[in-house]
Interface confidence: low
């Protein structure tokens, strides 16, 4: 499929101008190669009309230009003084006309409307409101006022002052007769439909002295805004429909066959299953505007999207709408990363998050997508040393391996951790990716004691048992804190006896704490890694207490099978400030995630995304 993208249809009127934008992947080669606009012939060739190398056909002389914007990956063709002869099929493309790096564009130039003299033209967007003003003379002040629509050869009554309303306009039209001072009546039609377009006639009086006024109503279908985004990236649709629909339900839908528009998300709580875990509808402003963020873009997300307002929360005739044509570029700069990561209860996952490598200094974030209402994504951890209180000791964001990827490790997994998580930064908002964590049946691979109490001044050894499957991995112990996990010296004490059917390659690696102090209290992790890529981890909380006791204490594996002492764990937690994105609009705007705080801890329902790209908890 060609990665070039532009408008499928362009409509205009004789004498007007059009501006056609074509998008291309902004690679170094593409930025500098020839750009062209050509007209397709009946026999399949494509005759160049204008190119970026300076060529302009005689048909376009003095009325067209082509401008390349390499930094945006776009070029624009402007054509003026359009005639009906310009109607036809065109291509915008890169390189040689016949090479296929192009996009088909249909240009339709229609005749301007033949208007009667003294006709007032009203040009209004679909779904909006028009007020047709109709002046009259004093002698007709007390006479019947009416509005007709010209249907073929005949005028059809739409509304009159005796109370008649044409059924096609019921509930969306009114006739206002101003106070006696003003010789004017107005007809207001709202929720405009395409079928409302046409010639109208206002009339005051019914005899030969009646006052008449012609009006031409043009109802505009919104031209879709072209949106060009990378596969696996994200898109934000900003929808501003105006304050008059501020209190009406909003929706985003995707056009399927014909005129159908399937709801993607709406403010009444509906959400299409295909977007579960990767969509947020951001709260409305007072003016009724809102935005929708979709992450983890897929090929099948490409298409035409409409946002609108209607009490049903879906597209209806007369809904005010805005339109976008989304193209998903498969030559993506965003690397593949697993969309599903699996872990077992009590075990861990290590999630790789891609980011724009040009923004290595940006703040990295990880948040939990919550589907309730319109979706939100409260932050769990960031790269500046903040971790949500409930995740202390079991969650860490590491800048490794770097160069466009960071790592998030979550351990002590429970079924409540199943769900969708977003990787994001305060830099390029297009680099938002989604990963689903699934909790599957099984036992954690690493075995550690459930809880450990150390005595001040003593020496403590905490064991971690690694099965033979990790024989080639680097094994480590570290002390967890808000900014990561600081490596500690550890001792390989030989083969472990903790695993059945595991040869001499299983290992027991101990953490030794000499002369325990209060500062040693906290969370310790043992784990495996290969270079800068992290695998499984297991966590132990070490509590410190005063007790007169001699010698050192070994913590045996027998304790590892004991259930963790929840009281010790709870008392060990140090409440720190809790942080989340309170205003999800920050996702939708090109700016940093604000340093706001939120105590909310929402539901963790998991819905299968149906992805085939999966990652086990211990693989990378």
């Amino acid at each position: 499929k060609s990665p070039i993208f532009g408008p499928e249809e362009v409509n205009s009127v004789e004498g007007n101008s059009v501006s056609i934008t074509c998008y291309y992947p902004p690679t170094s080669v593409n930025r500098h190669t020839r750009k062209y606009w050509c007209r397709q012939g009946a026999r399949g060739g494509c005759i160049t009309l204008i190119s970026s190398e300076g060529y302009v056909s005689s048909k376009y002389a003095g009325r067209a230009n082509l401008t390349n914007f390499p930094e945006n990956g776009t070029f624009v063709v402007n054509i003026a003084q359009l005639s009906q002869d310009d109607s036809g099929r065109y291509k915008c493309g890169l390189g040689i006309n016949s090479r296929g790096l192009s996009f088909d564009v249909s240009l339709e130039v229609s005749q301007g409307p033949g208007l009667l003299n003294d006709t007032k033209v009203y040009t209004v967007d679909l779904g909006r409101t028009v007020t047709i003003n109709c002046p009259f003379k004093t002698e007709n002040a007390q006479k019947r006022k009416s509005l007709y629509k010209q249907i073929g050869l005949y005028p059809v009554l739409v509304i009159d002052s005796s109370g008649y309303v044409n059924p096609n306009y019921t509930g969306r039209i009114r006739l206002d007769i101003q106070g006696t001072g003003q010789l004017l009546f107005s007809v207001v039609i709202n929720q405009l439909r395409l079928s409302d377009a046409g010639q109208y006639l206002c009339q005051a009086g019914d005899d030969s002295n009646s006052n008449k006024k012609n009006a031409d109503l043009q109802v505009l279908k919104p031209e879709p805004e072209l949106v060009y985004e990378d596969l696996r990236g994200s898109v934000t649709f900003h929808c501003a429909l105006g304050p008059e629909v501020a209190n009406v339900a909003k929706f985003l839908c995707r056009q399927s066959s014909g005129e159908n528009c399937d709801v993607v998300v709406n403010t009444l709580g509906k959400r299409a299953p295909a977007f579960e875990g990767r969509i947020l509808l951001n709260p409305q402003d007072k003016d009724g505007s809102f935005s929708v963020v979709i992450t983890g873009l897929r090929k099948e997300d490409a298409g035409r999207y409409l946002c609108g307002a209607h009490s049903d929360g879906q597209l209806q005739e007369g809904s005010p709408i805005q339109a976008w044509q989304l193209f998903v570029n498969e030559e993506s700069t965003i690397p593949r990363s697993p969309t599903v990561v699996k872990g077992v209860a009590g075990g861990s996952v290590a999630v790789l998050c891609p980011y724009n490598r040009k923004e290595s200094k940006s703040i990295k974030y990880w948040c939990l997508w919550e589907g309730a209402q319109n979706g939100r994504c409260p932050l769990l951890v960031d790269s500046e040393g903040w971790v949500k209180a409930q995740y202390e000791g079991r969650l860490s964001l590491l800048e490794e391996p770097g160069n466009g990827t960071f790592t998030v490790i979550l351990n002590q997994l429970t079924s409540r951790d199943a769900g969708f998580y977003w990787c994001l930064t305060n830099g390029d908002t297009l680099w938002r990716t989604t990963v689903e964590i699934k909790i599957i049946e099984g036992e954690p691979n690493l075995k550690v004691p459930g809880n450990v109490t150390a005595v001040l001044g003593e020496t403590l050894k905490v064991p971690c048992h690694f099965p033979c499957k990790f024989s080639s991995y680097e094994k480590y112990w570290c002390k967890w804190n808000n900014t990561g996990c600081q490596a500690l010296p550890s001792q390989d004490e030989g083969p472990s006896k903790a695993f059945v059917n595991c040869d001499e390659n299983s290992r027991l690696v101990s953490l030794t704490l000499n002369l325990v102090t209060r500062a040693d209290e906290g969370w310790y992790w043992c784990g495996v890694k290969q270079g800068h890529f992290y695998g499984e981890t297991a966590a132990v909380y070490v509590a410190v207490e005063e007790r007169k006791a001699a010698g050192s204490r070994d913590v045996s594996l027998a304790k590892a099978d004991a259930a963790p002492d929840e009281k010790v764990l709870d008392s060990g937690f140090r409440e720190i400030e809790n942080k989340a994105i309170q205003d999800p609009r920050l996702f939708a705007e090109e700016k940093a995630v604000a340093d706001t705080r939120d105590q909310a801890d929402g539901s963790r329902a998991s819905v299968d995304s149906g992805s085939s790209e999966e990652q086990g908890g211990s693989s990378r």
Epitope: I159, S161, S162, G163, V165, G171, R172, I173, R174, L175, D176, I177, Q178, G179, N190
Partner: nanobody, 121 residues
Framework: EVQLVESGGGLVQSGGSLRLSCAAS????????MGWFRQAPGKERELVAV????????SYADSVKGRFTISRSNAKNTVYLQMSSLKPEDTAVYYC??????????????WGQGTQVTVSS
């Protein structure tokens, strides 16, 4: 269809005040002009005050100008008539009316059942 229910009528002394309310049910209340009319025994129904859909235009009978005020709340689907400096000749059944057309005649499409206002001297 619009259904209208008036309330707030009653007996009041001359010079007193009353506030009538008219609650509308049905769709698109804010697209209707609303009016208050009255009918005294043995007399024709007459216009008291009307207000357009937005509240931006109002019209009053000469006999009530400066004493009565019509207003509306589209959020509450209600139109009000604040009556002060009441006179015995204001005694009548007061009717609320609605129409998609703002007019100062009696040709309104939808009517309430009425509420009695009696002003004693």
């Amino acid at each position: 269809e619009v259904q209208l229910v008036e309330s707030g009528g009653g007996l009041v002394q001359s010079g007193g005040s009353l506030r009538l309310s008219c609650a509308a049910s049905g769709r698109a209340f804010n697209y209707y002009a609303m009016g208050w009319f009255r009918q005294a025994p043995g007399k024709e129904r007459e216009l008291v005050a009307v207000i357009n859909w937005s509240g931006g235009t109002t019209s009053y009978a000469d006999s009530v100008k400066g004493r009565f005020t019509i207003s509306r709340s589209n959020a509450k689907n209600t139109v009000y008539l604040q009556m002060s400096s009441l006179k015995p000749e204001d005694t009548a059944v007061y009717y609320c009316a609605a129409d998609s057309i703002y007019r100062t005649s009696k040709d309104y499409n939808y009517w309430g059942q009425g509420t009695q206002v009696t002003v004693s001297s």
